[in-house]
């Protein structure tokens, strides 16, 4: 909370309200929607960001082929239930008592059911594949320059440890960024790959979550990298459980 600066704002989360009534009269920033105090020296969890958002006055061979168990977030926005640490609760329900299980990035991983549905544990998303298509440029980007720039971005802007950026693939105009982070690899204080991916997604859409910073200006050797399409695939440590009806649809 001390990272909230003297002017009492939260550099890493504009979806907060900050006031000088924290311990010792210091600036304290609370997430909209949940009222939870957030640590402004790091990324805010995706669950709290989604909750704030809902409450705010408001294919080539060299590329990775997502596995059959990969999830895409097709359900869109919802007002999630977050646990005491700001993470997604394993079971989410809407106002009409329809419930479903989610993974650690809040994406549905079961069919929808009723209040009797059980979600025994929050299943970790350990592999995220960010699939981007950039706008036409005079020529292809240099792969190693592109790789270095995206790794720098995740390290410096999102504070994600470089070891969690597993690979950057490129075959013009498609870029794929692979993030991997097993439960055993994630130490206290490490940014979660799900949170980093969400901040990146919002940046790419021109909806930066950072306070007062300009939007994302991605350049490779001075050449602007403008993204025209984004798809994100989520792979869980335990495969999702959907009925055959959905799988054959």
């Amino acid at each position: 909370h001390t990272a909230a600066q003297d002017n009492c704002t939260c550099p890493t989360n504009k979806m907060t309200v900050c006031s000088p009534d924290g311990p010792g009269g210091r600036c304290q920033c609370r997430a909209l929607g949940s009222g939870m105090a957030v640590d402004c020296s790091t990324l805010t969890s995706k669950c709290l960001l989604l909750k704030a958002r809902m409450s705010a006055p408001k294919n080539a061979r060299t590329l990775v082929r997502p596995s059959e168990h990969a999830l895409v977030d097709n359900d869109g926005l919802y007002d999630p239930d977050c646990d005491p640490e700001g993470r997604f609760k394993a079971r989410q329900c809407n106002q009409t008592s329809v419930c479903w299980c989610v993974n650690s990035v809040g994406v549905r991983r079961t069919d929808k059911g009723d209040l009797s549905l059980r979600c025994d544990e929050l299943v970790r998303t350990h592999h995220i594949l960010i699939d981007l298509r950039h706008r036409p440029t005079a020529g292809a980007f240099n792969h190693s320059d592109l790789d270095a720039e995206l790794r720098r971005l995740f390290r410096e802007r999102y504070r994600l440890h470089p070891k969690f950026v597993a690979a950057v693939h490129y075959e013009q105009p498609t870029i794929q960024i692979e993030l991997r982070q097993n439960t055993s690899q994630k130490a206290a204080g490490d940014v979660d790959i799900g949170d980093a991916a969400y901040y990146f997604e919002r940046d790419i859409k021109g909806e930066s979550l950072f306070q007062g910073r300009g939007g994302l200006d991605l350049r490779v050797r001075g050449e602007p990298l403008q993204v025209e399409r984004t798809l994100i695939y989520y792979l869980d440590e335990i495969p999702p459980k959907f009925s055959m009806k959905r799988l054959t649809a």
């Epitope: 909370h1 009492c8 309200v17 006031s19 000088p20 009534d21 924290g22 311990p23 909209l32 929607g33 949940s34 009222g35 939870m36 105090a37 640590d39 006055p57 005491p84």
Partner: antibody
């Protein structure tokens, strides 16, 4: 010095609405949350919700959502709590406080009596 | 919602003796840095008065016989040497998440 001064006692009929005001002075009104708390006769404290006058952001206790409305007039440094569809169990003293958890300054309280 | 359970409901202590009031939360209200628990004193016909903020920070103007401790789910308000003017009802409140609930109160009397 910091002061919160609330409006006077009210007597209302069931089904009516009441609007309690809380005038702040001695600090920058837009920088702090204003919380509202209910205390029924002989009972404990119950958190209703809060408002951040600097942006009009509000939070509500689900129990009061839909019936309580929190607003603020920054030009008058005054916060308001309106409670609608009054019933007998709304008879209570209502307090405003600066800050939410750990409210460091409180109004004197406004007694609202709901009686037919 | 986080439920705060205060104990005891009422307490009688002799003047000059130590008084201890407990507050247990239904889930942790602490991070590694801070505990989001606060203590108030309320005398009849008066608004609550903040004594302790963030579990252990004494509010300005509050006598140093009052102290707060605890983290996680268990918190304690201690009055080291009870004075006559300390007769009141004491409440804990968390500010971890919405709604910021209060404990049921502890009535402190002189034995």
């Amino acid at each position: 010095q910091v002061q919160l001064v609330q409006s006077g006692a009210e007597v209302k009929k069931p089904g009516a609405s009441v609007k309690v005001s809380c005038k702040a002075s001695g600090y920058t009104f837009t920088n702090y949350w204003i919380g509202w708390v209910k205390q029924a006769p002989g009972q404990g404290l119950e958190w209703i919700g809060d408002i951040y006058p600097g942006g009009g952001y509000t939070n509500y206790n689900e129990k009061f959502k839909g019936r309580a409305t929190l607003t603020a007039d920054t030009s008058a440094s005054t916060a308001y709590m309106e409670l609608s569809s009054l019933r007998s169990e709304d008879t209570a003293v209502y307090y405003c406080a600066r800050g939410t958890g750990g409210g460091d300054y409180w109004g004197q309280g406004t007694l609202v009596t709901v009686s037919s | 919602d986080i439920v705060l359970t205060q104990s005891p409901d009422s307490l009688a202590v002799s003047l000059g003796e130590r008084a201890t009031i407990n507050c247990r939360a239904s889930q942790s209200v602490s991070t590694s840095s801070y505990s989001y628990m606060h203590w108030y004193q309320q005398k009849p016909g008066q608004p609550p008065k903040l004594l302790i903020k963030y579990a252990s920070n004494l509010e300005s103007g509050v006598p140093d016989r009052f102290s707060g401790s605890g983290s996680g789910t268990d918190f304690t308000l201690t009055i080291s040497s009870l004075q006559a003017e300390d007769v009141a009802v004491y409440y804990c409140q968390h500010s971890w998440e919405i709604p910021y609930t209060f404990g049921g109160g502890t009535k402190l009397e002189i034995k």
